[in-house]
């Protein structure tokens, strides 16, 4: 019961996490710029992985996609790749984990197969969560170190004077969504891996039991595969081979012609 609960909870937590990773990847607010008060209108600029948006104080908002790949920083491309890998792995993990759920019966699937699938999905969730956390952290680091900010505050170009208005970009909501979602996916994956241990059928260690035949005094002891005649050095029914069991190893039986030990 505890295994089913752990597996089910792991699945739900991972599902929420992956939904969060998808949401974060699609969000525009990865970085937000402090409000810039222009004499005409206050301008608020925010950017995501796929497009840049500007909102005016009037409420007018315009978003433009990054249509070129060549002009984008390599780090941004890396963040995109990490988030997509995270989503893909998470989606595959969800698909695998649905079939691995103990509460769902599919044909005559054995527990060992379900355990393997649970472990696989768990590992996928862990890697997915790590990808999301890594992607969001790389982007956050870019903002902190002003990776893509213009270094010059003012310079004179062909068309006159160019002045950098704002270099302070702060963490957007998408970063926090991404961190939380990645963490949830990671936790869900760990729970699935824990559930896998409970699902795996353990090898049964049978204890040695002696079966006394009614007619002949013969002791059958599983575990050993050596036989001795009842004569000679083993007349006291001493153990020739001990399979590790201790239940009735010392039971006294009179030597007979065929004494299986």
């Amino acid at each position: 019961m505890a295994v089913t609960a752990c597996q089910g909870l792991g699945f739900v937590v991972s599902l929420i996490g992956i939904a969060g990773i998808i949401a974060a990847t699609c969000m525009d607010q990865w970085s937000t710029q402090d409000l810039y008060n222009n004499p005409v209108t206050a301008v608020f600029n925010y950017q995501g992985l796929w497009r840049s948006c500007v909102r005016e104080s009037s409420g007018f908002t315009e978003c433009r996609g990054y249509f070129t790949l060549l002009g984008l920083p390599a780090m941004l491309q890396a963040v995109r790749a990490l988030m997509i890998v995270g989503i893909v792995l998470g989606a595959i993990g969800l698909l695998v984990s649905i079939f691995a759920l103990k509460c769902i019966r599919i044909g005559s699937m054995e527990d060992s197969a379900k355990a393997n699938m649970t472990l696989t999905s768990g590992i996928m969730f862990i890697v997915s969560g790590l990808c999301a956390i890594a992607g969001v952290s790389v982007f956050a680091n870019m903002l902190v170190t002003n990776f893509w900010m213009s270094t010059a505050n003012m310079y004179t170009g062909m068309g006159g004077m160019v002045q950098t208005v704002q270099t302070r970009y702060t963490f957007g909501a998408a970063l926090f969504v991404g961190w939380v979602a990645g963490g949830l996916t990671l936790i869900g994956g760990v729970m699935m891996c824990i559930a896998c241990r409970g699902l795996a059928p353990e090898e049964t260690n049978y204890k040695a039991v002696s079966y006394h035949a009614s007619g002949h005094s013969v002791a059958y002891k599983p575990g050993g595969f050596k036989a001795s005649t009842g004569f000679g050095s083993n007349t006291k029914n001493k153990k020739i081979y001990d399979g590790g069991a201790r239940t009735e190893d010392e039971v006294q039986s009179y030597p007979s012609k065929h004494d299986y030990v």
Partner: nanobody
Framework: QVQLVESGGGLVQPGGSLRLSCAAS????????MGWYRQAPGKQRELVAG???????NYGDSVKGRFTISRDNAKNTVYLQMNSLKPEDTAVYYC??????????????WGQGTLVTVSS
């Protein structure tokens, strides 16, 4: 890099009209605000008129009712239609644009200026 090309300045008689234009080009994602400022000899630079991407306009007190600002978003161009010009409108007119250039850099770009002289 963002460049501004201004045109339309010159000598005009009082009561006359002029049309200034300013085209922005280069690495541009957005131009939230485009506008015109002016600086007369020995005076501070002042706002003449500005227009946002959404169509919000703002005019300097001295030009209200006489000047009209407009923009062509497709061409990244701003126009200033100046009517009923007065001698006190004589100044160097500077184009000013707020540009989101590339990812994460917001620039305020100034043109080199075009001289408008109102004299009889």
């Amino acid at each position: 890099q963002v460049q501004l090309v201004e045109s339309g300045g010159g000598l005009v008689q009082p009561g006359g009209s002029l049309r200034l234009s300013c085209a922005a080009s280069g690495s541009i994602f957005h131009i939230p605000v485009m506008g015109w400022y002016r600086q007369a000899p020995g005076k501070q630079r002042e706002l003449v008129a500005g227009i946002s991407r959404g169509g919000t306009t703002n005019y300097g007190d001295s030009v209200k009712g006489r000047f009209t600002i407009s923009r062509d978003n497709a061409k990244n161009t701003v126009y200033l239609q100046m009517n009923s010009l007065k001698p006190e409108d004589t100044a160097v007119y500077y184009c000013n644009v707020l540009v989101v250039s590339g990812i994460g850099s917001t620039l305020e770009v100034w043109g080199q200026g075009t001289l408008v002289t109102v004299s009889s």
